[in-house]
Amino acid sequence: RRDVAHGILNEAYRKVLDQLSAGKHLQSLVARGVGGSLGGGAGDDAEPLSKRHSDGIFTDSYSRYRKQMAVKKYLAAVLGKRYKQRVKNKGRR
């Protein structure tokens, strides 16, 4: 049982480390100014990032990063005819 407990703790610790490294990656995206003016869904308004809003930095920069990835795939499909990159997850909604 002790081994199982250690395994669970190690797994939890690894997840925390993963989240921290992801956070650092997102901070680097913010520093590089990733994202643009292209809008996502309603209620997803992009505001200038400030130190006072540091709690929202990761979420905000991640959503911008996702938008950029989505538009890249779109452009590849519609202007580059790279159909393998088209989103095909029909069952999601």
Partner: antibody, heavy 112, light 109 residues
């Protein structure tokens, strides 16, 4: 015959709302990107935004907040909801599968 | 945001002429994802060329595209009666999705 047909256009007062539909026949739209583009009378083409197969929509910055793209896969139809309409929104609105198959367009006139 | 400038805005030509339309971008087009469309009055645009130089299926071989980065051209090697129309370039813009050029009207001389 493979085609897209837009509907829902017409005359609307400034500040009003309108929902345009884009229905497909002869093709399953579900796995395609769907795009809306508009063209003011005598002017060029203007990109509004797109929706992916999963239902996530992305917009040009000028359209965000007033325009909403959605899709109903069971009806093989895509929609463009337009709110707080202005005179400068007067245009023919086109839907397109990717950008290689287009509908004939539907005219929206915003005027009092 | 990318601005696409087409020149000339109007072009007068005769059947059989070689016609060249230029599309200049204010910054590099993402992935060279630049397309050309043909539009006739009262009709929807027709997809001609994608990724700057690749011909869409069913489009006559007299149409060709070239260029990269910020400078692109559409060439019609021998203008046919059916080719009198307005042509638009469209480029990939990560910030704004798709940017269209202002259009070039090809009319009969």
């Amino acid at each position: 015959e493979v085609q897209l047909v837009e509907s829902g256009g017409g005359l609307v007062q400034p500040g009003g709302s309108l929902r345009l539909s884009c229905a497909a026949s002869g093709i399953d739209l579900n796995s395609y990107y769907m795009t809306w583009v508009r063209q003011a009378p005598g002017k060029g083409l203007e990109w509004i935004g797109f929706i992916d197969a999963g239902g996530d929509a992305y917009y040009a910055s000028w359209a965000k907040g007033r325009f909403t793209i959605s899709r109903d896969n069971s009806k093989n139809t895509v929609y463009l909801q337009m709110n707080s309409l202005r005179a400068e929104d007067t245009a023919v609105y086109f839907c397109a599968r990717d950008l290689d198959l287009w509908g004939q367009g539907t005219l929206v006139t915003v005027s009092s | 945001d990318i601005q696409l400038t087409q020149s000339p805005s109007t072009l007068s030509a005769s059947v059989g002429d070689r016609v060249t339309i230029t599309c200049q971008s204010s910054e590099s087009v993402y992935g060279n994802y630049l397309a050309w469309f043909q539009q006739k009055p009262g009709k929807a645009p027709k997809f001609l060329i994608y990724e700057a130089s690749k011909l869409e299926s069913g489009v006559p071989s007299r149409f060709s595209g070239s260029g990269s980065g910020t400078e692109f051209t559409l060439t019609i090697s021998s203008l046919q009666p059916d080719d009198f129309a307005t042509y638009y370039c469209a480029g990939g813009d990560i910030s704004e999705g798709v940017a269209f050029g202002g259009g070039t009207k090809v009319e009969i001389k």
